[in-house]
């Protein structure tokens, strides 16, 4: 007779990433007896919630429950019923909600309150919904990619310390691009972090890490576009904005009220003699790049070195994983290969932006026009941000790795967040005995 397989002794966790443009739910799974080992937690499912980000529900909070239903029901189906009550659920909201809170703390609280009530109705162990800080977002993204890459996995054997990765223990830096903010996080080489706000100290698996992180609010790709439009319309002679960041032949009407809705455009706000204006694409990479650079104030730096807007940035060090919108945009543009040089990326962006809108629509018939129309801007913005904002060079460009998933888990802050909240990253190195090591998978 065949041996019956023992029931899997696994645990689950759920994290909802409430971003500025949409919400995603991630289910994580790990063997119960190995929760303090590195690299054992993996993403078993993901669900993208239909609709916009939660901050857009400010005038219709009663719809939040329905909005979350499909993905929460999918989670209920995906996790065995016997595990429901001990499965923690966390919701972390990022820059979209940070911006809403800047406008009105009361409105942000109301949205979160309804989210919490909705999530409490499910049979899981709901642990709360909160707006995470930009610093947390950067730090948890850094933890996620390094955890998945096995960078923390210097296993202590019962008889000696044998690194699994002999020459490759340097951590990766993390570059995260969202709709409303962007984060840069890495371990600088023998460099004092001059600004205390940007310094983090971690002790993970027995090793100390001095980490630099900064989150640039309003510099996610969507808010950067709003900033650029608000800046450029200031000097437009009429209600037509000839825009180099959109394809030739592209036309779109923008309401001035929408433009000034976000706190990110406040610095460019002025009384305009029209209620709406029309974007007319002219598709010129170089001019688009120049326009984007005007969003980065590099004239002032109170430190030895800055990124932009007076924010300290140490010299870049080592390899970087660029994920979220960095990856999605570059993947669409077919520019994620490590060997595509920065010069080649620039060249390809010039050609892409110059393509007529009608041609682009035909070539990418399956892509929603709203997204399709913005790839020229987004690609140019990514190049501008990395090269002029963060000071990557043609040489260091080759150390940027555009990453979607690692070992089947999305690169992003959610896994790191859950690992931290479930205390699954020990400060000290867990000692493995001969028996537990022999059963290692």
């Amino acid at each position: 007779t065949q041996n019956k397989a023992l029931p899997e002794n696994v645990k689950y966790g759920i994290v909802l990433d409430a971003g500025s443009s949409h919400t995603s739910l991630y289910i994580y799974k790990w063997p119960a007896e190995k929760e303090n080992d590195t690299g054992v937690v993996h993403q078993s499912a993901e669900c993208r919630v239909k609709g916009p980000g939660i901050s857009k529900f400010v005038q219709k909070v009663n719809e939040i429950g329905i909005y979350l239903t499909d993905c929460m029901e999918a989670a209920r189906e995906a996790i065995p019923r016997s595990q429901h009550q001990e499965t923690p659920v966390y919701l972390g909201a990022t820059a979209g909600m940070r911006l809403l809170r800047m406008e009105s703390e009361e409105l942000a609280d109301r949205v979160l309150d309804v989210v919490e009530r909705s999530l409490s109705n499910y049979p899981f162990d709901f642990q709360g919904a909160r707006i995470i800080t930009g610093q947390e977002e950067g730090a948890y993204g850094w933890i996620t990619i390094n955890y998945l890459l096995g960078k923390f996995s210097q296993k202590t054997r019962w008889f000696s310390i044998v690194p699994y990765e002999t020459n490759n223990q340097e951590t990766f830096g993390a570059l995260d691009l969202g709709g409303a903010s962007t984060q840069v996080t890495f371990v600088p080489q023998n460099q004092t972090i001059e600004s205390p706000d940007n310094a983090l100290q971690f002790r993970l698996y027995g090793k100390d890490y001095n980490v630099y992180t900064h989150s640039f609010l309003c510099y996610g790709k969507d808010q950067a576009l709003w900033q650029k439009l608000a800046k450029d319309i200031q000097v437009a002679s009429n209600e037509i904005l000839r825009d180099p960041c959109f394809h030739p032949g592209y036309k779109k009407v923008v309401n001035v009220s929408d433009l000034y809705k976000t706190p990110c455009t406040k610095r460019f706000e002025m009384t305009l003699p029209f209620q709406q204006f029309e974007i007319q694409g002219i598709g010129n990479y170089q001019q688009c790049h120049q326009s984007i650079l005007e969003l980065f104030n590099t004239s002032y730096c109170p430190y030895s070195q800055c990124a932009f807007n007076g924010i300290f940035l140490p010299p870049l060090q080592g390899d970087f994983g660029a994920f979220s919108a960095f990856y999605f945009v570059m993947k669409f543009l077919n520019l994620t290969s490590e060997k595509v040089s920065q010069e080649k990326v620039t060249e390809m962006m010039k050609k892409f932006c110059a393509q007529p809108w009608e041609e682009i629509k035909t070539s990418y018939a399956g892509v929603k026009e709203k997204y399709l129309s913005e790839y020229c801007f987004s690609g140019t913005y990514i190049l501008s941000l990395l090269l002029q904002g963060y000071h990557f060079t043609a040489d260091s460009w080759e150390h940027i790795h555009f990453i979607g998933k690692i070992q089947g888990s999305d690169a992003g802050w959610t896994l790191g967040y859950m690992l931290n909240l479930t205390n699954m990253i020990p400060a000290e190195q867990p000692l493995s005995t001969p028996l537990s090591h022999s059963t290692y998978v």
């Epitope: 990765e165 490759n168 060997k339 080759e398 998933k405």
Partner: antibody, heavy 118, light 108 residues
Framework: PVQLQQPGAEVVMPGASVKLSCKAS????????MNWMRQRPGQGLEWIGE????????NSNQRFKGKATLTVDKSSSTAYMQLSSLTSEDSAVYFC???????????WGTGTSVTVSS | EIVLTQSPTTMTSSPGEKITFTCSAS???????LHWYQQKPGFSPKLLIY???NLASGVPTRFSGSGSGTSYSLTIGTMEAEDVATYYC?????????FGGGTKLEIK
């Protein structure tokens, strides 16, 4: 266990087409790229192309453009490669393999032996 | 495309010996993109080492990898009879992904 199952063999006529399958199990199919490789008798490995099952995005080796078409069926967690206008040169073992960051192939199918013969 | 050259094409060794396979790339590769596989006759290839130096799951610790730039190597600390196979390096750094021609390890 994570597995990629492929049919053992296919015999096809010259000029015809064949659609090879690769059924994934034991993991979330849409979370990893699927790659295809060719190995001619007594030869080394050649990469044909890759597909991301989450959005059907593909990259392929120029050498196989017009020869190989990659598709997936998410509902059955199966990847397919259609080979067209077959000649004796296409007689080989074709492997599917799961890809991860760094573009290494951590799980391989058992391989399908394709023989082009009249 | 990046061409990977493996040498030697064939090597003969005795159990207990230390063996090193080399893989030379036609242009520099970031170490995160160089991997090694073992293929036994009639079987599918099996991942041994990924990202230059990381041991794949279930692979004996006698296997190790190192290298950077254009020069990479795979070492078997103490050869065993079951290691008779062909060993391939592979790069994922650029499209198309490419494999080395392989080194066939035979037993003395």
């Amino acid at each position: 266990p994570v597995q990629l199952q492929q049919p053992g063999a296919e015999v096809v006529m010259p000029g015809a087409s064949v659609k090879l399958s690769c059924k994934a199990s034991g993991y979330t199919f849409t979370s990893f790229w699927m790659n295809w490789m060719r190995q001619r008798p007594g030869q080394g490995l050649e990469w044909i192309g890759e597909i991301d099952p989450s959005d059907f995005y593909t990259n392929s080796n120029q050498r196989f453009k017009g020869k190989a078409t990659l598709t997936v069926d998410k509902s059955s967690s199966t990847a397919y490669m259609q080979l067209s206008s077959l000649t004796s040169e296409d007689s080989a073992v074709y492997f599917c393999a799961r890809g991860d960051f760094g573009w290494y192939f951590d799980v391989w199918g058992t391989g399908t032996s394709v023989t082009v013969s009249s | 495309e990046i061409v990977l050259t493996q040498s030697p094409t064939t090597m003969t060794s005795s159990p207990g010996e230390k063996i090193t396979f080399t893989c030379s790339a036609s242009s520099s590769i970031n170490s995160n993109y160089l991997h090694w596989y073992q293929q036994k006759p009639g079987f599918s290839p099996k991942l041994l080492i990924y990202r230059t130096s990381n041991l794949a799951s279930g692979v004996p610790t006698r296997f190790s990898g190192s290298g950077s730039g254009t020069s990479y190597s795979l070492t078997i600390g103490t050869m065993e009879a079951e290691d008779v196979a062909t060993y391939y390096c592979q790069q994922g750094s650029s499209l198309p992904r490419t494999f080395g021609g392989g080194t066939k390890l035979e037993i003395k």
